[in-house]
């Protein structure tokens, strides 16, 4: 019996009955065995078929078989109810080999011409399976010439059988206090040949509780305990399971903070698996009772390990642990069922004793010594000589623990000295002057330091003077001996002040005229204001109206008198303001250089002379009465004049203070 072609020869060709296309003889038997390469199959079809027809093709036939399976037994020319002829059918081997057998019996009633067939090897598409048959691959099947291969979706790995996809389902660790885990693909069927390990690992002190939820379906066996697929639960104390079947296992209270769940599947079955919802519990901490005037947040039925609460105090109360203040308080429940810190108190805010007010006093309004939340105090300044600046002096103890004014200020009010008070109710280089009485010129300052000069007290720690009077001491402020509160130049009874810094106007040039002849001395301490020591006021914007030509100003000092000596007693002189053009003209003739009198100067004195300021009065104030406020203000600073004090046709020249208000204010606010 011819074998036919065998691989690796080319697998295609023609088969025909003996004698074809002539009639075939009786008692013939012919067998062909065709073999294709692995992964290929054989395709066969007939181009001519003419065999004797007999019941179930018992006489003459062509039989096609592949392995042990008969694919077809063929006879006749056309198919009948019980016999089959090939017609246009194509036949395929089941594997890579095909057997063809031709047989004729002992007789033919008439001549039959037999058959002609063609065959060829073709690739098998292993990925195509008949309905109802198991798929070739678990997930993805890839056909190629001569074979196929399988691959898996993400999260799976190809089993060593090269067809099954095993789940990559180990090493998952759950650390949250509750959660869910399930078999792979749940609720769809779980994968075959898989071994899954899940870990729940909570902090020490927690105990894991497992609840099986929704559905449970793991392949089982009626007699043997879970021989195929199973679920096991392991703790450090005990093992639960194995579990399989269709009944939801009961809740498992593991009494452990670590749990390992193992799920193993075999190669067969179609089951949906399982789902576990896990929670945890721990030893509860004592229920937190809020301190008086406080509340707990969040409010829970119970507090267990890692749970926390915070305490919030009502407005006007503050968190204190003993004497120590806290901005916030949070306690955490520990594994032994205790809180990690004790409960604080919500204590009423206490602003404490209010600070002393320099030159003022404080009065408790709410009650003697009451300094707690919403308590009220009243600051006031020492009458007559001080006035309160900015606010009304009423302060409330607020929730932040600070005494706060009605304007929201937390700083103390300021008792500012009242300026421009004088014992004189009306208005001499004091030359031709009169003796001053106590309280007449309480702003008068005596400056000693090389020469005798004067100044005027501003506020309670500044002295206004002439630049030329303190120029030599500008770098050695401490050399200035500053005295106030006395009438007698040589008296041992005076208030001593010392200079902290000297500020000379940047526009002043020493020994080159007297323009910008103005300076400020900052005292190193505030002086106490009284009837003998009171600051002079600075001019208001409207002050020019009290300093017109012929308006009377008063100059005071210990300068030279008519007798040619420094005055022992403070002297003063009332002198009128001189027209500026008239004064300029008076100083345009020699020996004075042109432009000696500038717009930053004002002149005062009598045309007839006799009343003037003189050497030793330099830096002192030329003051005017503001009739609206009834306060004295400084209009001029004794600066320069004729060599002969009180000379007719010559006038005393003063620095015009109103021109320097911004300069004065800037220096005082900056320093």
């Amino acid at each position: 019996t011819p074998l036919g072609p065998k691989w690796p020869e080319p697998v295609f060709g023609r088969l025909a009955s003996p004698g074809f296309p002539g009639e075939y003889a009786n008692d013939q038997e012919r067998r062909w065995t065709l073999t294709a390469p692995p992964g290929y199959r054989l395709r066969l079809y007939f181009t001519h078929f003419d065999l004797e027809l007999s019941h179930l093709c018992e006489y003459d036939f062509v039989k096609l078989s592949s392995g042990a399976k008969v694919l077809a037994t063929l006879c006749g020319q056309e198919s009948t109810d019980t016999e089959r002829a090939p017609g246009k059918d194509t036949f395929y081997s089941l594997g890579s080999s095909l057997d063809i057998t031709f047989r004729s019996d002992y007789s033919n009633e008439k001549p039959f011409t037999g058959f002609e067939a063609f065959y060829a090897a073709e690739d098998i598409d292993e990925c195509q399976v008949a309905p109802g048959e198991a798929p070739t691959c678990d997930h993805h099947c890839h056909n190629h010439l001569g074979g196929f291969y399988c691959s898996c979706r993400a999260g799976y790995v190809l089993h060593r059988n090269k067809r099954t996809c095993s789940a990559l389902c180990s090493g998952q660790v759950f650390t949250q206090r509750s959660g869910e885990l399930s078999s792979p693909e749940y609720p769809r069927p779980y994968p075959k040949l898989s071994s899954c390990t899940y870990s729940i690992s909570l902090e020490e002190g927690f105990s894991v509780i497992l609840d099986f939820v929704e559905s449970f379906d793991v392949e089982t066996h009626p007699e043997t305990l879970c021989p195929y697929d199973f679920l096991k639960i392991q703790t450090d104390r005990e093992e639960h399971g194995p579990f399989c079947g269709k009944t939801l296992p009961h809740r498992i209270e593991t009494k452990s903070n670590t749990v390992t769940i193992t799920f193993v599947t075999d190669e067969s079955g179609d089951h949906t698996g399982w789902k576990i919802h896990y929670t945890s519990t721990a030893q509860p901490c004592p229920y937190p009772m809020a301190p008086p005037n406080g509340h707990v947040s969040p409010v829970q039925a119970k507090y267990i390990l890692k749970d926390s609460f915070s305490i919030f105090c009502e407005t006007g109360y503050e968190l204190l642990q003993g004497h120590l203040p806290l901005k916030s308080f949070t306690a955490v429940c520990q594994k032994d069922g205790s809180w990690d810190r004790p409960m604080p108190a919500c204590s009423i805010v206490d602003c404490g004793p209010p600070d002393d007010l320099p030159s003022g006093r404080v009065e408790y309004i709410t009650g003697p010594g009451v300094t707690t939340y919403k308590a009220v105090i009243q600051y006031s300044c020492e009458e007559t000589f001080y006035t309160m600046k900015v606010n009304d002096g009423k302060y409330v103890c607020e929730a932040d623990g600070f005494w706060t004014s009605s304007k929201g200020e937390k700083s103390l009010p300021v008792c500012e000295p009242v300026c421009g008070l004088s014992a004189r109710t009306t208005g001499g280089r004091i030359y031709g002057g009169q003796k001053a009485k106590p309280g007449d010129f309480p702003w008068q300052v005596l400056i000693l330091g090389g020469t005798t000069a004067a100044g005027a007290l501003l506020y309670d720690n500044w002295v206004l003077t002439a630049a030329h009077a303190v120029y030599e001491q500008k770098h050695d402020a401490s050399a200035l001996d500053i005295r106030m509160g006395t009438l007698k130049r040589l008296s041992p009874h005076y208030t001593q002040a010392w200079s902290e810094a000297v500020f000379i106007h940047e526009g002043y040039t020493h020994d080159a005229g007297f323009d910008n002849d103005i300076a400020l001395i900052k005292l190193n301490n505030k002086v106490v204001i009284n009837s003998n020591i009171t600051p002079i006021c600075l001019p208001r914007k409207e002050a020019e109206s009290f300093m017109r030509t012929d308006d009377i100003g008063t100059a005071s000092g210990w300068g030279l008198t008519q007798r040619g000596f420094l005055a022992r007693n403070l002297m003063y002189v009332d002198i009128p303001i001189v027209d500026h053009q008239k004064c300029t003209a008076a100083y345009e003739k020699p020996p004075y250089p042109r432009g000696s009198v500038t717009a930053n100067m004002l002149c005062a004195g009598l045309e007839s002379g006799g009343k003037d300021s003189c050497r030793g009065d330099s830096g002192g104030a030329l003051v005017f009465l503001d009739s609206e406020t009834e306060r004295w203000f400084v209009g001029g600073i004794v600066s320069w004049g004729s060599m002969n004090c009180g000379e007719a046709g010559q006038y005393g020249v003063y620095t015009k203070v109103i021109n320097y208000i911004p300069w004065i204010e800037n220096i005082i606010s900056d320093f």
């Epitope: 642990q321 003993g322 004497h323 120590l324 203040p325 806290l326 404490g352």
Partner: antibody, heavy 118, light 106 residues
């Protein structure tokens, strides 16, 4: 980590003022807690001097009221001690410390030695 | 001011021993007491707060107890590194330290 560092002169003359600075790193002094000055005299006795709280409020040892002032500069995360009219009895090692009564760790500076002597 | 009295200035002990350092307040301070350990040349280190709460990182051989006026710091199984001076601090009303107890080897 919270760190505190004291700085200031090691020698002060009697009747003068003692001024020390505590520089805090790793935590804002306005966030919470009390920021204290504590001193340790020769012989190891510890004395709490006072604190400035996160809000800027101060509390002083009653025995030092009138001489002590604690202030702060929140922009530099520093707080300061000023002790006026010092005498030889104020010779000590001065520590700045964050004290919280258990609400967070206590942290101390390494201390700075101050001698009052003419 | 509340006075905190540590009656024993020195205490002798051996490695492995159990020792108790006591502190008495002149008036009720609730549980607002802390304990500190100080070694020569170092700043104090906090051990216990609120009378009985141990700071994290402090070995559990250190325990604190007491409330009101009487407080105790107990060191069980004394180690050589525990030889130091121990101070109590009350922070109930202002802050005051005890005078200190020095733990030394027998």
């Amino acid at each position: 980590d919270v760190q505190l560092q004291e700085s200031g002169p090691g020698l002060v003359k009697p009747s003068q003022s003692l001024s020390l600075t505590c520089t805090v790193t790793g935590y804002s002094i306005t966030s919470d807690y009390a920021w204290n000055w504590i001193r340790q005299f020769p012989g190891n006795t510890l004395e709490w001097m006072g604190y400035i709280s996160y809000s800027g409020r101060t509390s002083y040892n009653p025995s030092l009221i009138g001489r002590i002032s604690i202030t702060r500069d929140t922009t530099k995360n520093q707080f300061f001690l000023q002790l006026n009219s010092v005498s030889t009895e104020d010779t000590a090692t001065y520590y700045c410390a964050k004290l919280a009564g258990g609400h967070g760790m206590d942290y101390w500076g390494q201390g700075t030695s101050v001698t009052v002597s003419s | 001011n509340i006075v905190m009295t540590q009656s024993q200035q020195f205490m002798s002990t051996s490695v492995g021993d159990r020792v108790s350092v006591t502190c008495k307040a002149s008036q009720n301070v609730d549980t607002n007491v802390a304990w500190y350990q100080q070694k020569p040349g170092q700043s104090p280190k906090a051990l216990i707060y609120s009378a009985s709460y141990r700071y994290s990182g402090v070995p559990d051989r250190f325990t604190g107890s007491g409330s009101g006026t009487d407080f105790t710091l107990t060191i069980s199984n004394v180690q050589s590194e525990d030889l130091a001076e121990y101070f109590c601090l009350q922070y109930n009303s202002y802050l005051t330290f005890g005078s200190g107890t020095k733990l030394e080897l027998k």
